[in-house]
Interface confidence: low
């Protein structure tokens, strides 16, 4: 049967009545429905609402809807002792503690099961010392203390803002620092835009807020104690001490009110210069210890946490294809909140639920796709992405096989400014041909595409006319699928105006005010934005289920890959000397970089002119875009992150949220200036440079003619 | 001198309600987190409930929780617990104590008895 035959109707009609049917009201629905109460990943609410999303898909008419349950190392606070820090006199008695829980919002006083503020992963611990103000917690800031300002964080409990990097990556640079303790707070100069009001009659953090959230180190390994294999009835686990990717200092985080009383009081040195002051209202020294009259006092942590082996639930929905149902498209977002979840991660869910009511709909209608669209709500995402990743080994011989793409969907808005998109480059002309097709939400936009007011108001910074696309990095349930498995995978949300809010992240993220009626209320009133990312997300899930010819455009690979290869280049290029010493070259990487263009571009001729009727052609090169990002995988993985595979793409080292691209290399240049055995790192430089070139010349050639 | 000293205990019947204070001098209240603490005749010590320096934060031992209410007044330096529902099981000597577990300082107790 050809593509139009097994889906009824022609594609342009499906396409239109897919999005037709996709209703803002019905998304605000979901979202209500799914914020009523706490789905922390491990208990009963949350497997009580996967049983729902289970029975209202299959109702949607998915044709099977299954439950993939795990047993996972989780982490939980002890509820009959209390997690708290304290300042303690000479005498050793308290004279300050922390909030013990976040005040509850309006109208939630009375729900129970709130999980108190923790950070997820901590192991238990009462350390006492010594306040060392760390900024940001980032490579930079501990470079900035240690080398500049003589600062020793050995023994010391460090205090570090949220902000700029994931917190895993703060609690590791405090631990390689020497630190005992972690201190996590929110500074309202990152969680408290001007001119806005707090919670409840704004969408900012008030003082008692607080973001919970993991603190660990997985580097893509899934659940700590089962790395590279699903955590199942029969699983071999791990011992807790060779557990990946813990923790080894205590780990707590505060709010705003809390954090000014302890760093009201600190001593030692000045910041050294404005980046490291926030917005309260106190000096921002950076220590060791108090000021004159409180240097005798301390601080001490009380962290009792448990880390437990629990179940966790996904729900796979499966919409079979009808011409190739050997080949997926994923559609996946987490289920799992800290507290209520509105926006992290039900905006996300409940647009994933309408999506598959939509597709649902037009299969009661006869209509299938041409490939097998699979669905998933993830489990316990919030401590570390466990969920997918498991799910992800477990099929991971069908996944490498028969992926084609995988869409991301989890908070469908951090603001309603305007869109962004993280993707694959083979991603780049899908994502800008559907954006032409959809109204764009935005005031002062009526009547024109969403590619207009995109591109408007995040241009790209280095092509004209075009909006910003970046890179994928981590701290999502694409991970595996990108990182590990080598599937073309991408994200699209409603982001925040970033040159006017230079706040982190949104403010009440990972806090108990984080409800539907923030919202409701503050972001999407009329659940327009909600609609726009169903559209994008649902829009590209049905462009790559259902197109005749996969949309990926290999040309736009061949593009990027220049541009790594010449910032990666110039980076090496701040040591002349020592390249000219060690005979560092790049000229592999970049006739490799070459060849991938010439060959990106005779395939993409050959892709207009091959006869399409012909099932056995089309399939040939469906499979050549297909596995091209598969082709970028390295099966030993980077160095000391061996499920970190892709050799263009991987989350930086510093940052598990950003991208960085060639990592490989760029991680071997990395403060290579102050490493003990230069002729060694400069070994491993070159090494490097030959696994990136290498990798690029294998992928071109896996677009070459076949035989 | 540090000192806690408990009130309001004294013989109810079940389903009754009983508010016990807990007046703090020596130190300066309103810094400290402050807990009950209760201890029936014969068993160990059980935790019942604790509340944060600024009153915002609030937490309750699963067996009291929907009937006991804990609170301060910073202004008088002065604990409470607002006992309701009371159950023969809730009899106990009820201490305050200052700061978090583990607690430096405690009252002498105040004797609560729950009988029909």
């Known amino acids: 049967k050809s593509s139009n035959e097994a889906t009824n109707i022609t594609p342009k009609h499906n396409m239109k009545a897919f999005l037709d049917e996709l209703k803002a009201e019905n998304i605000k629905k979901f979202l209500y429905n799914f914020t009523q109460i706490p789905h922390l990943a491990g208990t009963e609410q949350n497997f009580q609402l996967a049983k729902q999303i289970q029975s209202q898909w299959k109702e949607f008419g998915l044709d099977s809807v299954e439950l993939a349950h795990y047993d996972v190392l989780l982490s939980y606070p002890n509820k009959t002792h209390p997690n708290y820090i304290s300042i303690i006199n000479e005498d050793g008695n308290e004279i300050f503690n922390t909030s013990l829980f976040e005040p509850p919002p309006p109208g939630y006083e009375n729900v129970s099961d709130i999980v108190p503020p923790f950070s997820a992963f901590s192991p238990q611990g009462m350390p006492e010392g010594d306040l060392v103000y760390v900024n940001y917690a980032r490579t930079e800031d501990f470079f900035k203390l240690e080398r500049d300002m003589k600062i020793n964080c050995s023994g010391k409990i460090v205090i570090a803002r949220y902000g700029k990097v994931f917190r895993g990556n703060k609690v590791k640079n405090a631990q390689l620092a020497g630190a005992k303790g972690v201190i996590l707070y929110s500074d309202p100069a990152d969680y408290f835009a001007p001119g806005v009001k707090s919670y409840p009659d704004g969408w900012n953090l008030p003082g008692g807020g607080v973001q919970r959230g993991n603190i660990l180190n997985l580097n893509g390994a899934g659940d700590p104690l089962t790395p590279g294999y699903p955590a199942n009835e029969y699983a071999y686990r791990r011992g807790i001490a060779e557990a990946v990717g813990l923790p080894s200092i205590p780990v707590h985080p505060i709010g705003y009110y809390d954090a000014q009383k302890l760093l009201e009081k600190m001593g030692g040195s000045a910041p050294p210069d404005s980046s490291w002051r926030g917005s309260l209202k106190v000096p921002y020294n950076v220590g060791p210890g108090f000021t004159g009259n409180f240097s005798t006092q301390k601080v001490k942590m009380h962290i009792h946490s448990t880390n437990e082996v629990t179940r966790i639930y996904n729900v796979i929905g499966t919409l079979r294809g009808a011409v190739e149902p050997d080949r997926y498209v994923i559609l996946g977002g987490h289920r799992d909140s800290w507290v209520f979840g509105g926006i992290d991660p039900q905006s996300g869910a409940a647009v994933v639920h309408e999506i598959v009511r939509s597709f649902g709909t037009l299969k009661k209608e006869g209509w299938r796709p041409r490939r097998t669209i699979l669905f998933a709500s993830w489990d316990a995402e919030e401590f570390g992405l466990l969920g997918s990743t498991e799910w992800a080994e477990e099929n991971s011989r069908l996944l490498q096989e028969r992926g084609v793409a995988y869409i991301n969907a989890d908070s469908s808005i951090e603001g309603n400014y305007t869109l962004r998109v993280d993707c694959t480059p083979l991603m780049y002309s899908l994502v800008h041909n559907l954006t032409k097709e959809l109204k764009s939400p935005d005031e002062g936009f009526e009547g024109k595409s969403l590619y207009e007011s995109w591109t408007k108001k995040s241009p790209s910074p280095e092509f004209s006319g075009m909006p910003r696309i970046s890179k994928l990095g981590s701290g999502n349930d694409f991970e595996v699928f990108f990182q590990r498995l080598g599937i073309a995978s991408g994200r699209a949300r409603y982001t925040k105006n970033w040159e006017t809010n230079k706040f982190s992240g949104y403010p009440l993220y990972h806090s108990v005010y984080e409800t539907y009626e923030l919202v409701e209320k503050f972001y999407d009133p009329m659940f327009k934005y909600h609609l726009t990312v169903a559209q994008v997300r649902g829009g590209m899930v049905f462009e790559l289920a259902n197109s005749i010819v996969l949309p990926f455009d290999c040309r736009d690979y061949a593009v990027v890959l220049r541009k790594y290869a010449d910032k990666i280049y110039s980076i090496s290029m701040k040591h002349p000397q020592e390249m000219k010493t060690y005979s560092v070259s790049f000229d592999s990487l970049f006739s490799a970089v070459k060849n991938f263009t010439e060959i990106a571009s005779k395939f993409s001729e050959r892709l207009q002119d091959f006869d399409k009727s012909n099932p056995i052609v089309l399939r040939m090169m469906n499979d050549q875009l297909m596995f091209l990002e598969r082709a970028f995988i390295d099966p030993l993985g980077l160095p000391d992150r061996p499920f970190y595979r892709h050799v263009i793409y991987a989350p930086s080292s510093h940052n598990k949220y950003a991208g960085e691209s060639f990592p490989g290399i760029y991680d071997a240049l990395f403060d290579i200036e102050s490493k003990v055995d230069p002729s060694k790192a400069w070994g491993e430089v070159k090494r490097q440079i030959y696994v990136a070139a290498f990798t690029v010349q294998a992928a071109a050639e896996t677009l070459s003619e076949v035989a | 001198e540090v000192q806690l000293v408990e009130s309001g205990g004294g013989v109810v019947q079940p389903g009754r309600s009983l508010r016990l204070s807990c007046a703090a001098s020596?130190?300066?209240?309103?810094?400290?987190?402050m807990h009950w603490v209760r201890q029936a005749p014969g068993k160990g010590l059980e935790w019942v409930a604790i509340?944060?320096?600024?009153?915002?934060?609030?937490y309750y031992t699963d067996s009291v929780k929907g009937r006991f209410t804990i609170s301060r007044d910073n202004s008088k330096n002065t604990l409470y617990l607002q006992m309701n529902s009371l159950r023969v099981e809730d009899t106990a000597v009820y201490y305050c104590?200052?700061?978090?577990?583990?607690?430096?300082?405690w009252g002498q107790g105040t004797t609560v008895t729950v009988s029909s």
């Open positions: 509340i944060s320096y600024d009153g915002n934060s609030k």
């Open positions: 104590a200052k700061g978090l577990w583990p607690s430096d300082v």
């Open positions: 020596g130190f300066t209240f309103n810094n400290y987190g």
